[in-house]
C-alpha cells in the first residue's frame, strides 16, 4: 500500500497504527511530540521500505531504536527536504541507536542528528555508503563517543562479523547496533545494490533486491516504478509522479490536491503528473490538464504575509518556485548548503520583480547573485531604515553581483548599501550604480571602498594564451608568464576548465562557497626556468567536445590599502579533435535468402565527431568442429572458467598514542585559547543551530484544528 501525501504522527503513539500497511510513504514521515514514554516493542512495520520525501523524529519519549519500528526501511528519496535534510533526528531523549540496518540509500539531501543525549552508534555508521555527499551532514550534541563504547557484532568474541571502511582516516568496523552490521555490497557491483547474499541487483534497483539482476525484484527503484518493474523512464501513456513512480492519465486526473480544496487539479506536463504547471508554462484553460508555454515568463505573483521573506535554506527558497513577481521584501541569509547556487537558481531564478527591498547579509555560501537570473526590477516601495532598497552586508565570499554585460536591473526607488564584503570589488558595485540608475543616490557612507573587496584581486591584469594544441582527448595550452611588480609574489597558476557546448559560460557558473563548482581546477607550478612559458596538459577529455578554459595567477601582491593585485585570462573555447567512434549499437543480421544477409544497426552512443559513413565488413567462416564435439543433450555442463579474485588483505596499523608534554617535565599542555576566527566560527555555528531550531518549531507547531 502507498500511504501519503505525508504522515504526521504526534501526541499519541497509537497513531503509529496508521503505518501498518504502508510499503511506501509517498511524502514525508513525521513522528514527534510524544511526551509520555511508551513501550514501542509491539509496534513493528516491516512492510515500510521507502519514504519518498524525508523522515523527521522529534521529542518522542521512550523510543530507544528505530530498528524494530522500521526493520526494512531501505530508501529515503529526499524528493522534498526538511531544511536541506532528508533525515532529521532531533531531541530524541531516549534514542540509543538509530538501528535502521536496512537503510541503504538517501537519494537527495543530508542528515541532521542533533541533541540526542543518549544516542550512540553514530561513529560506526559510514554515511558515505548511503549518501552521495557527507559534507553537509550535521551530527552534533549527541552522546559523546567516548561514553558510548560502541561495539560491532562479534568484536568482543574476536570474531568480527562486519566489514571495515575508512572514515576520517580511521579504518574500522561498520554497524548500526550491537547485533546489526552495516550492509556493504561487493565492489564488483559498483554503484548497484545487492541482495542479502551479496549478488548484484539489476542496475534499475536502488537499496536492495530479493533476486539478482531482476528489475521486478527491487526493493526500491533507482528511477521509476511501473507495474511491478523498475524502469529507467516511464513507458508511453504513463507519467512520472512524485519523483518515483509512473501513473496513467486517469490516475492523474483524479488526484485531489492536499494543499487546497479549490485547486484546479493536477496537470500533465513533460511526461510528469504534477500539482501545477512548471515555471514558463500555464494551463491551457482553467479546467485543462495540460500546460502551454507562456509568452515570455508566466506571471505568478507571490506574496509574503509577513512582508519579508527570509531565504536561509533551500527549503525556504522552494516556496518561491515559479514566482515572477514577489510582493514584499527579500532577505537572503544563506550561510551554508550543498550545491546551493544551482538549487537557488532552480527556485528563485524566475523572479523578475521585487516590490520592496532586497537585503543580502551573512550569506557566506554565496559567490554570486546570478541565481536571481531574471531579476530586472526592484521597486523599493518599502525600504530599510536609511532609505535602502538594496542592502548587501557581510558576505564573506561574494565576488560577483551579476554579469552586467548581459543584465538590465533597475532600482526604481531607494539607495544601495554595501559593507564588509571582502571579496566584492568596489568597481563591481560602481558598475551596478550605473546599470541600476542609482548613481548619485548613494552617499559616501553607503559604499565603503575599504571593507569591500579588500581580499579580492580587484586589480586584474590579463593573462594571454600563447599556444593551444589539441588531440582527441587532450588539450595543451601555454600562456604568457605573468610578471607582477615583485616577481617573488607570483606563487602559481590555477587552470579552470569544463565542457561548454555553447560559448556562454561565466566564471561563476554553478559556483558557491561551500565547494560546489561546475569548473574543474588544476594547479600549475611555475616553470623553474624563467624563460619557459607556463602551460598545462589537460588529459582524460572527451573527443570532439568543446571546452571552456581560463587561467588565474595566484599572487601575494598587494597594492596600497591591502588590495590584492591578480591576473587572469579571458575564457577560451577550444574543441578536442575527433576520434574513432564507439561501436555501432544493436547490430542485427538476418538472412532473407540463400545469398543475402540484411544487417541493421543503431548509431554509436559516442560518435566522437561528425559521422560521415559506416564500413561494413564480412567474411565467410568455416564451421567450427568444436560445435560437433560436445553433446549438448548430456547433463554435463560446459565448464566455466574461474578468474582469480584480486582481493588484498589490509593489515591494520596501530600507532602508540603520543602524549604531548610542555617544556620538559611540566606535564600535559593546557588547551590553547581560542583564536578570533574560532570564536567567530563558534558564534556562527550557534546561530545556524538557532535558525534550524526556529525553522523546526515553526514547521511542526501548528494550531489545533477547530
Amino acid at each position: 500500500e502507498i500511504c501519503g501525501p505525508g504522515i504526521d504522527i504526534r501526541n499519541d503513539y497509537q497513531q503509529l497504527k496508521r503505518l501498518e500497511n504502508c510499503t511506501v510513504i509517498e511524502g514525508y514521515l513525521h513522528i514527534l511530540l510524544i511526551s509520555k514514554a511508551e513501550d514501542y516493542r509491539s509496534y513493528r512495520f516491516p512492510k515500510l521500505t521507502v519514504i519518498t520525501e524525508y523522515l523527521l523524529l522529534f521529542r518522542v519519549a521512550g523510543l530507544e531504536s528505530l530498528g524494530d519500528l522500521f526493520p526494512n526501511l531501505t530508501v529515503i528519496r529526499g524528493w522534498k527536504l526538511f531544511y536541506n535534510y532528508a533525515l532529521v533526528i532531533f531531541e530524541m531523549t531516549n534514542l540509543k541507536d538509530i538501528g535502521l540496518y536496512n537503510l541503504r540509500n538517501i537519494t537527495r539531501g543530508a542528515i541532521r542528528i542533533e541533541k540526542n543525549a543518549d544516542l550512540c552508534y553514530l561513529s560506526t555508521v559510514d554515511w558515505s555508503l548511503i549518501l552521495d555527499a557527507v559534507s553537509n551532514n550535521y551530527i552534533v550534541g549527541n552522546k559523546p563517543p567516548k561514553e558510548c563504547g560502541d561495539l560491532c557484532p562479534g568484536t568482543m568474541e574476536e570474531k568480527p562479523m562486519c566489514e571495515k571502511t575508512t572514515i576520517n582516516n580511521e579504518y574500522n568496523y561498520r554497524c548500526w547496533t550491537t547485533n546489526r552490521c552495516q550492509k556493504m555490497c561487493p565492489s564488483t557491483c559498483g554503484k548497484r545494490a545487492c541482495t542479502e547474499n551479496n549478488e548484484c541487483c539489476h542496475p534499475e534497483c536502488l537499496g536492495s533486491c530479493s533476486a539478482p539482476d531482476n528489475d521486478t525484484a527491487c526493493v526500491a527503484c533507482r528511477h521509476y516504478y511501473y507495474a511491478g518493474v523498475c524502469v529507467p523512464a516511464c513507458p508511453p501513456n504513463t507519467y512520472r509522479f512524485e519523483g518515483w513512480r509512473c501513473v496513467d492519465r486517469d490516475f492523474c486526473a483524479n488526484i485531489l490536491s492536499a494543499e487546497s480544496s479549490d485547486s484546479e487539479g493536477f496537470v500533465i506536463h513533460d511526461g510528469e503528473c504534477m500539482q501545477e504547471c512548471p515555471s514558463g508554462f500555464i494551463r491551457n484553460g482553467s479546467q485543462s490538464m495540460y500546460c502551454i508555454p507562456c509568452e515570455g515568463p508566466c506571471p505568478k505573483v507571490c506574496e509574503e504575509e509577513k512582508k519579508t521573506k527570509t531565504i536561509d535554506s533551500v527549503t525556504s527558497a522552494q516556496m518561491l518556485q515559479g514566482c515572477t513577481i514577489f510582493k514584499g521584501n527579500l532577505l537572503i541569509n544563506i550561510r551554508r548548503g550543498n550545491n546551493i547556487a544551482s538549487e537557488l537558481e532552480n527556485f528563485m531564478g524566475l523572479i523578475e520583480v521585487v516590490t520592496g527591498y532586497v537585503k543580502i547579509r551573512h550569506s557566506h555560501a554565496l559567490v554570486s547573485l546570478s541565481f536571481l537570473k531574471n531579476l530586472r526590477l526592484i521597486l523599493g516601495e518599502e525600504q530599510l531604515e536609511g532609505n535602502y532598497s538594496f542592502y548587501v552586508l557581510d558576505n564573506q565570499n561574494l565576488q560577483q553581483l551579476w554579469d552586467w554585460d548581459h543584465r538590465n536591473l533597475t532600482i526604481k526607488a531607494g539607495k544601495m548599501y554595501f559593507a564588509f564584503n571582502p571579496k566584492l570589488c568596489v568597481s563591481e558595485i560602481y558598475r551596478m550604480e550605473e546599470v541600476t540608475g542609482t548613481k548619485g543616490r548613494q552617499s559616501k557612507g553607503d559604499i565603503n571602498t575599504r571593507n569591500n573587496g579588500e581580499r579580492a584581486s580587484c586589480e586584474s591584469d590579463v593573462l594571454h594564451f600563447t599556444s593551444t594544441t589539441t588531440s582527441k582527448n587532450r588539450i595543451i595550452i601555454t600562456w604568457h608568464r605573468y610578471r607582477p611588480p615583485d616577481y617573488r609574489d607570483l606563487i602559481s597558476f590555477t587552470v579552470y576548465y569544463k565542457e561548454a557546448p555553447f560559448k556562454n559560460v561565466t566564471e561563476y557558473d554553478g559556483q558557491d562557497a561551500c565547494g560546489s563548482n561546475s569548473w574543474n581546477m588544476v594547479d600549475v607550478d611555475l616553470p623553474p626556468n624563467k624563460d619557459v612559458e607556463p602551460g598545462i596538459l589537460l588529459h582524460g577529455l572527451k573527443p570532439w567536445t568543446q571546452y571552456a578554459v581560463y587561467v588565474k595567477a595566484v599572487t601575494l601582491t598587494m597594492v596600497e590599502n591591502d588590495h590584492i593585485r591578480g591576473a587572469k585570462s579571458e575564457i577560451l573555447y577550444i574543441r578536442t579533435n575527433a576520434s574513432v567512434p564507439s561501436i555501432p549499437l544493436d547490430v542485427l543480421s538476418a538472412s532473407n535468402s540463400s545469398s543475402q544477409l540484411i544487417v541493421k544497426w543503431n548509431p554509436p552512443s559516442l560518435p566522437n565527431g561528425n559521422l560521415s559513413y559506416y564500413i561494413v565488413r564480412w567474411q565467410r567462416q568455416p564451421q567450427d568442429g568444436y560445435l560437433y564435439r560436445h553433446n549438448y543433450c548430456s547433463k554435463d555442463k560446459i565448464p566455466i572458467r574461474k578468474y582469480a579474485d584480486g582481493t588484498i588483505d589490509i593489515e591494520e596499523v596501530t600507532e602508540n598514542p603520543k602524549t604531548e608534554v610542555c617544556g620538559g617535565e611540566k606535564g600535559p599542555c593546557c588547551a590553547c585559547p581560542k583564536t578570533e576566527a574560532e570564536k567567530q566560527a563558534e558564534k556562527e555555528e550557534a546561530e545556524y543551530r538557532k535558525v534550524f531550531e526556529n525553522f523546526l518549531h515553526n514547521s511542526i507547531f501548528v494550531p489545533r484544528p477547530e
Partner: antibody, heavy 119, light 112 residues
Framework: QVQLQQWGPGLVKPSGTLSLTCAVS?????????WSWVRQPPGKGLEWIGE???????NYNPSLKSRVTISVDKSKNQFSLKLSSVTAADTAVYYC????????????WGQGTLVTVSS | DVVMTQSPLSLPVTPGEPASISCRSS???????????LDWYLQKPGQSPRLLIY???NRASGVPDRFSGSGSGTDFTLKISRVEAEDVGVYYC?????????FGGGTKVEIK
C-alpha cells in the same frame, strides 16, 4: 608617504580647454581611494569639481558636469582634468586631492596650479 | 545640493585664548553607520588646504590635540583650546556625505 604632484598650462584662452594632470607617488592610484579635483577662484572659497575611482567610475559637480571630464591612467599612476569652453569665471587655483577610502575627506592635496583664462 | 553655512566670517583671536567656529548644514550629515560626514580644513596663505578633523571628531595625523571637533546631524563646531600664532588662516568645513561635496564659505582666523 603619498604625494600628489600636479601640472598643466597656467594660461588658457577663453572657449579653450583647460587640461591638468596629477601624478600619485608613494602609493597606487589603484588603491581604495577616490581622486578629486577642487578649485578656488582668487580670494574666494573652495569648490569641488569632481572625482574618479581607478575603475573609471566618476562623479561630477552638476554645475560643471557638461564641461568636465576626469580620466585615469593606471599605467602612469596619474589622473587628469579637462574643462572645456572656459571663461574668465574659471580662473582659479586648481587642486588635486585624495578622498581617503571614498569616505568624504581629503587627506592629501596637490600643491595647486593657478590657471588664468585670458586672451 | 547640501548647503554649508559657516560663522563667523572673521574671527580675531588672542594667542593662548580658546576659539570656536560653527558650521551648519542644510540636511543631516549623520549616516546610518553612525558617522557624521563633516570635515574641517585649514588653509594658510599661499598653501593648499590641510585636513584637521574628519568624520565629525577624528583628528587627522599630525594635528595638535588643541583642535577638536564636535556636533552631530546639522550643527558642528571646531574648537581650538589655546590659539597659537601658527593657527592663523582660513578654516573651512566640508560635507563629505553626498556628491557634490560642498564647502562652507570659510572663517578667517587672525591674531588681534
Amino acid at each position: 608617504q603619498v604625494q600628489l604632484q600636479q601640472w598643466g598650462p597656467g594660461l588658457v584662452k577663453p572657449s579653450g580647454t583647460l587640461s591638468l594632470t596629477c601624478a600619485v607617488s608613494g602609493g597606487s592610484i589603484s588603491s581604495s581611494n577616490w581622486w578629486s579635483w577642487v578649485r578656488q577662484p582668487p580670494g574666494k572659497g573652495l569648490e569641488w569639481i569632481g572625482e574618479i575611482y581607478h575603475s573609471g567610475s566618476t562623479n561630477y559637480n552638476p554645475s560643471l558636469k557638461s564641461r568636465v571630464t576626469i580620466s585615469v591612467d593606471k599605467s602612469k599612476n596619474q589622473f587628469s582634468l579637462k574643462l572645456s569652453s572656459v571663461t574668465a569665471a574659471d580662473t582659479a587655483v586648481y587642486y588635486c586631492a585624495r578622498d581617503s577610502s571614498g569616505q568624504g575627506y581629503f587627506d592629501y592635496w596637490g600643491q595647486g596650479t593657478l590657471v588664468t583664462v585670458s586672451s | 545640493d547640501v548647503v554649508m553655512t559657516q560663522s563667523p566670517l572673521s574671527l580675531p583671536v588672542t594667542p593662548g585664548e580658546p576659539a570656536s567656529i560653527s558650521c551648519r548644514s542644510s540636511q543631516s550629515l549623520l549616516h546610518t553607520n553612525g558617522y557624521n560626514y563633516l570635515d574641517w580644513y585649514l588653509q594658510k596663505p599661499g598653501q593648499s588646504p590641510r585636513l584637521l578633523i574628519y568624520l565629525g571628531f577624528n583628528r587627522a595625523s599630525g594635528v595638535p590635540d588643541r583642535f577638536s571637533g564636535s556636533g552631530s546631524g546639522t550643527d558642528f563646531t571646531l574648537k581650538i583650546s589655546r590659539v597659537e600664532a601658527e593657527d592663523v588662516g582660513v578654516y573651512y568645513c566640508m560635507q563629505g556625505l553626498q556628491t557634490p561635496l560642498t564647502f562652507g564659505g570659510g572663517t578667517k582666523v587672525e591674531i588681534k
